[in-house]
């Protein structure tokens, strides 16, 4: 088992919004969980952004998750991964 | 292989507490998900809410005031405990692993459920 | 709250039978759909998830499609052991919803 490396970014989004994603690479194997939160609670999937979990061509995998948020709001939110028994949660950079 | 296996009290007066215990095997708790979903009888299902490996919950809205899940990851064991009972509380209550991979987000192991009559 | 609905509660078809069950949401889900067998004895089990992706372990005989609001399980070859209801469940919000079940029964 290889953990993966969890990595959060923003965006501007448009006017008073931004886009944070939530970047996982270098893990294995492939079946990760990575998801948004707000304030704890789990975001709908209908409000987040999957990319499909790609090969990084070192044997092990990348993924990302993204999610479009009000400015000045970023506290309220934490990227959310589990892998091979392990979990961690990740905040949104200031 | 996986099992996860719910047991209750079989019978709870109207006004009490409901308390089930979800046992598991073969996964930690740590790394996986685990939802609570229930159903009357002769009815369809309905989920309850969820634990997540960091002990972190979500509930359904119409629930979330009776609602309380819990877990002790060192015995393999959640908890569901729910408040003030009523008749229509009667059911048959079941525990299933979650699983979450981007786009696909399921319940992919159930176990056998455990019967719930709420009667004086 | 999304409001799944399958229309047909029960039906009956004969052994061989290409059975279709249909499912439709109160709102557009992207895909985001399971399905699940539930047996007599109360025993359930996946199918289908994300529309149309088989779980590991499910007969090839099984199959789902669908876009939008409105999704289909298909049996192609019925087989006794699939008598069972057949429910689908909804993610792409949150509470998770189920439908009412299919009942499928041997004519």
């Known amino acids: 088992t290889v953990p993966p490396m969890v990595n959060v970014t923003r965006s501007e989004a448009s006017e008073g919004n931004i886009t944070v994603t939530c970047r996982a690479s270098g893990f294995y194997p492939w079946n990760i969980t990575l998801s948004w939160r707000q304030d704890g609670v789990s975001l709908s999937h209908d409000t987040q952004q999957w990319g499909d979990v790609l090969p990084d061509g070192n044997g092990t995998y990348q993924t990302w998750v993204a999610t479009r948020i009000c400015q000045g709001e970023e506290q309220r939110f934490t990227c959310y991964m589990e892998h091979s028994g392990n979990h961690s949660t990740h905040p949104v950079p200031s | 292989q996986v099992q996860l296996k719910e047991s209750g009290p079989g019978l709870v007066a109207p006004s009490q507490s409901l308390s089930i215990t979800c046992t598991v095997s073969g996964f930690s708790l740590t790394g996986s998900g685990v939802n609570w979903v229930r159903q009357p009888p002769g009815k369809g299902l309905e989920w309850l809410g969820m634990i997540w490996g960091d002990g972190n919950t979500d509930y359904n809205s119409a629930l979330k005031s009776r609602l309380s899940i819990s877990k002790d990851n060192s015995k393999s064991q959640i908890f569901l405990k729910m408040n003030s009972l009523q008749t229509d509380d009667t059911a048959r209550y079941y525990c299933?692993?979650?699983?979450?991979?981007?786009?696909?987000?399921?319940?992919?192991?159930w176990g056998a459920g455990t019967t719930v009559t709420v009667s004086s | 709250d999304i409001q799944m609905t399958q229309t047909t509660s029960s039906l009956s078809a004969s052994l061989g039978d290409r059975v279709t069950i249909s499912c439709s949401a109160s709102q557009g889900i992207s895909n985001y759909l399971n399905w699940y067998q539930q047996k007599p004895d109360g025993t359930v089990k996946l199918l289908i998830y994300?529309?149309?992706s088989l779980h590991s372990g499910v007969p090839s005989r099984f199959s789902g499609s669908g876009s939008g609001t409105d999704y289909s399980l298909t049996i192609s070859n019925l087989e006794p052991e699939d008598i069972a209801t057949y429910y689908c469940q909804q993610y792409s919000k949150l509470p998770p919803t189920f439908g009412g079940g299919t009942k499928v029964e041997i004519k």
């Open positions: 994300y529309t149309s």
């Open positions: 299933a692993r979650g699983a979450y991979y981007g786009k696909r987000w399921y319940f992919d192991v």
